[in-house]
């Protein structure tokens, strides 16, 4: 039978037939920065080119005792997971290995930097197709390592890294904390976070998604036909590097932002038991397990969005938190969240020619998070319209008045420490869907966008009785771009998007006042792009044989339980 | 994923512009910073990545590295330039005593300096 990890990342449509793409990833080159590898292993022979790059910390002179097989173990296994003939994800991908980790699996930030520089120079000397760089390593937070990753990503390289095995916040480690890198946590066959006593997968807002990372069968450096199981976030990252290679091979023009959005979109949602994560990290950690797309056809028309959480603001009264989208993404809405409920809302503001989402802490608050909804919207022209506090009893309102602009998100920000319980109307006037409504003492910010074929609608779900969580989801074919709460009273902790669902959290029901005061409405703005759908249909008509489904259907490959059939 | 995050240590060493009478003193008001790994056992003191400002050319990187060596030698310190970066980030990797950090932070074009640290297979 197919190994559990390959089954898990295979779309359901293909599972019954055990399809494995025969040459997935053939247009892509994957660089592996790791230990030395056994390049003559049958799994990877002819697929991995060992470069002459080596930069590792000195090993003890007495290390001649250490067998080469152990020195090669980590890297050989990962190369097999990415592109192995039998147990690999992207069986057609070619790889290049750089040795930056010694026999103990230890390296240095400087050695890794020089390795990344080597890749950039190789790319400049001999430009090839899409490049994926796999960094199955982690150290403490490093400004310089993150900066180097950022530069390489901006040069068009896709970087995939391990979240780390420290059972800790991934933001405390590098390159896991680099925003441009795709950071991968590890899950097991039960879709639960990988744990081993005091250690386990890292988590938190710096993780992009999870992937299989426990009991992963792959090439063993014991012998050229040997296999072994290994576990860790390196194995998880190798799965995502393989999936990325498959996607890029099917669509070589994908940008990093597009690839990341697709990885998120095609992931299995809400399968991880969040109880394993520390309570304060649950909301920040993506509940996503990576999977291959069923096909690339039909993906192009989607309006892809993801949620980006800021770092915590800290508890000082004037503290703020900022969430940013990637350079190629559009900020379509901005919300905020505070566990204590003490916050002063959020606003979208320009910073360095780009919109960012800023959340404001309040006096006595333990701090806030800013939550950006970042979307791929080609040819978009977005602006923020602001209405100052209205003072009138009807509350503050703002709408998109420019021709062809649609409302994608609403934010509200207030200077007063406590908005109190003055309740603005929950229902907005009929025939005016394009407006944001907020508390009369708050300034309201509307995100208004013009993009070809973009249409949006507002969806609300109100609960009259107090409840800790109110949700509203966009229906099939629509994408959540905005998520906010009505009213903006102090018992609302905040609002945030989880996949296509808008979640509004309120204070524990026992601490809220009367029923009327406890009423909360979750407001979702759902959008779709007719333009992208049309473009995708045209593309489908003009191209054939380039999608992942064609690769999938080209050949059926059996998983061989016993690997000594090579003899 | 934020850039300035975690219990990461940043030591800001103030510039004393009069020292050494540098011909190319850093622009007014900018302070180069020193960074090191917050996880003590992973620190590798004695090796430092000197990161220069974004638009610094390779020739300027090499010149800055030589200047550091010369100024260190005048103070009786031996330094070794292990690598000059270009292509991704401008800068250089230097093996030197931590006593020279204050001096290095005052060099022209320096954006920040980071002490080397360990990374591990995951």
């Amino acid at each position: 039978s197919i190994p559990w990890n390959l089954e898990r990342i295979t779309p359901p449509r293909y599972r019954a037939d055990e399809y494995q793409p025969p040459d997935g990833g053939s247009l892509v080159e994957v660089y592996l920065l790791d230990t030395s590898i056994q390049s003559d292993h049958r799994e990877i022979e002819g697929r991995v080119m060992v470069t002459d790059f080596e930069n590792v910390p000195e090993e003890d002179g007495t290390r001649f005792h250490r067998q080469a097989s152990k020195c090669d173990s980590h890297g050989t296994h990962l190369a097999g997971v990415v592109s192995g003939r039998d147990a690999g994800v992207a069986k057609g991908a070619s790889m290049r290995s750089l040795r930056v980790l010694n026999c103990q699996g230890k390296g240095t930030v400087s050695g890794t930097l020089i390795g990344l520089e080597f890749i950039r120079k190789s790319q400049l000397v001999q430009p090839v197709g899409p490049l994926v760089v796999l960094l199955p390593l982690a150290g403490g937070y490093s400004r310089v390592l993150n900066a180097a990753c950022q530069r390489l990503a901006r040069a068009g390289v896709v970087l995939v890294t391990a979240a780390g095995n420290f059972r800790d916040d991934a933001c405390l480690y590098s390159p896991a904390s680099a925003p441009e890198v795709i950071t991968v946590g590890a899950t097991n066959a039960q879709d639960q976070p990988v744990t081993l006593g005091t250690l386990g997968t890292n988590f938190g807002r710096c993780v992009d998604l999870f992937a299989p990372g426990e009991d992963i069968i792959g090439a063993s450096s014991d012998c050229s036909t040997c296999f072994v199981s290994q576990s860790g976030t390196s194995q998880a990252a190798a799965h995502v590097a393989g999936i990325a290679a498959m996607m890029l091979s099917a669509e070589p023009e994908l940008t990093l932002a597009e690839l990341r959005q697709r990885l998120i979109h095609f992931s299995a949602k809400d399968v991880i038991n969040e109880a394993w994560f520390p309570e304060d990290q649950r909301v920040l950690t993506p509940n996503l397990v990576a999977a291959l797309p069923p096909s690339t056809h039909g993906a192009g028309w989607q309006l892809f969005c993801r949620t980006v959480w800021s770092a915590h603001s800290g508890p000082t009264r004037m503290a703020t938190a900022v969430a940013r989208c990637a350079p190629d993404e559009e900020l379509l809405s901005c919300s905020s969240f505070s566990r204590s409920g003490k916050r002063r809302g959020e606003r979208m503001e320009a910073q360095g020619g780009k919109l960012v989402c800023r959340a404001h802490n309040a006096f006595g608050g333990e701090g806030v998070y800013a939550i950006a909804r970042c979307c791929l919207l080609p040819q978009a022209n977005c602006s923020v319209h602001t209405a100052p506090p209205a003072e009138a009893s009807m509350g503050t309102r703002v709408h998109c008045h420019q021709q062809g602009h649609v409302l994608t998100g609403c934010s509200s920000h207030w200077e007063v420490e406590d908005l109190g319980t003055h309740k603005p109307p929950v229902l907005r006037p009929r025939g005016q869907p394009n407006q944001c409504v907020g508390h009369r003492e708050a300034s309201i910010h509307a995100s208004c966008c013009h993009a070809p074929g973009l249409e949006c609608k507002v969806k609300e779900h109100g609960i009259p009785a107090p409840q800790e969580q109110v949700t509203v989801a966009c229906e099939e074919g629509w994408t959540l771009t905005g998520c906010s709460a009505l009213p903006g009273t102090s018992h609302v902790l905040g609002a945030y998007a989880v996949d296509n669902t808008c979640v509004v959290r309120s204070r524990d029901v026992s601490t809220t006042g009367s029923t009327s005061e406890g009423a909360v409405t979750a407001v979702a703005i759902c959008c779709r792009s007719r333009h992208l759908a049309q473009a995708s249909q045209e593309l489908q008509g003009s191209t054939s044989g380039s999608g992942l489904n064609d690769i999938f259907e080209a050949q059926k490959i059996e998983w061989h339980e016993h690997h000594h059939h090579h003899h | 994923q934020e850039d300035e995050d975690g219990d990461y240590e940043e030591l800001v060493l103030a510039l004393r512009s009069e020292e050494d009478g540098l011909a190319e003193a850093p622009e007014h008001g900018t302070t180069a910073t020193f960074h090191r790994c917050a996880k003590d056992p992973w620190r590798l003191p004695g090796t430092y990545v000197v990161v220069l400002k974004e638009e610094t050319h390779l020739s300027q990187s090499e010149r800055t590295a030589r200047r550091l060596q010369a100024q260190a030698a005048r103070r009786g310190y031996l330094t070794k330039i292990l690598h000059v970066f270009h292509g991704l980030l401008p800068g250089f990797l230097v093996k030197m005593s931590g006593d020279l950090l204050e001096l290095a932070l005052k060099l022209p074009h320096v954006d920040y300096i980071e002490e080397d640290s360990s990374v591990f297979a995951q």
Epitope: T62, K70, C223, F227, S229, G232 | -
Partner: antibody
Framework: QVQLVQSGAEVKKPGASVKVSCKAS????????IHWVRQAPGQGLEWMGY????????KFNQKFKDRVTMTRDTSISTAYMELSRLRSDDTAVYYC??????????????WGQGTTVTVSS | DIVMTQSPSSLSASVGDRVTITCKAS??????VDWYQQKPGKSPKLLIY???NRYTGVPSRFSGSGSGTDFTLTISSLQPEDFATYFC?????????FGGGTKVEIK
């Protein structure tokens, strides 16, 4: 659950051979190396070697190299350790253990219950 | 072969005592040391992997430290079920080698 079940106690004469079996269950047998460790009465633990069940690859402690054979039968998820030319100082409890690799850390996470081998004339 | 020298070979302690067992390697084994507990007539059980990481289900009173050639297993507050023999083992190079063991007895 994951377990290793070993064959029963053996009494052998000097010069004879003994073959101890170790049946794995609860996991993919071909995914983990099986190591053999022995413990003489009142003594410490001594590593003998291992087999990678995905192939026939073995690695031995030089001390036992000429006398030990390690094999496996994947159809019944069983590993075997045969020690020949037995001497009285081979009297010991023989354990099989599964080696696990997590990150770059290696350890024996599952042990068999042990097989007592007594060598006596 | 790398020799792992464990000390003491035995010790007597009372419930609630803090117990420290040391292991010295004849050469640098980095952090590549595991610790096992064995009770009479039973198989060894993994306590600590890679010098300092507590294995699943192992009580927090057990901790490990060290790197290079010197390693320590500490039981912060000895419990009745902790009376057993403890072994260190290096996996840095073949052949794997174990320490001679430390028997922890009731005082």
């Amino acid at each position: 659950q994951v377990q290793l079940v070993q064959s029963g106690a053996e009494v052998k004469k000097p010069g004879a051979s003994v073959k101890v079996s170790c049946k794995a269950s609860g996991y993919t047998f071909t995914g983990y190396t099986i190591h053999w460790v022995r413990q003489a009465p009142g003594q410490g633990l001594e590593w003998m070697g291992y087999i990678n069940p995905s192939s026939t690859y073995t690695k031995f402690n030089q001390k036992f190299k000429d006398r030990v054979t390690m094999t496996r039968d994947t159809s019944i998820s069983t590993a075997y350790m045969e020690l020949s030319r037995l001497r009285s100082d081979d009297t010991a409890v023989y354990y099989c253990a599964r080696e696990r690799i997590y990150s770059n850390y290696w350890f024996f996470d599952v042990w068999g219950q042990g097989t007592t081998v007594t060598v006596s004339s | 072969d790398i020799v792992m020298t464990q000390s003491p070979s035995s010790l007597s302690a009372s419930v609630g005592d803090r117990v420290t067992i040391t292991c010295k390697a004849s050469q640098n084994v980095y952090w590549e040391v595991d610790w096992y507990q064995q009770k009479p007539g039973k198989s060894p059980k993994l306590l600590i992997y890679s010098a300092s990481n507590r294995y699943t289900g192992v009580p927090s009173r057990f901790s490990g430290s060290g790197s290079g050639t010197d390693f320590t297993l500490t039981i912060s507050s000895l419990q009745p079920e902790d009376f057993a023999t403890y072994f260190c083992q290096q996996y840095s190079s073949y052949p794997y080698t174990f320490g001679g063991g430390t028997k922890v007895e009731i005082k």
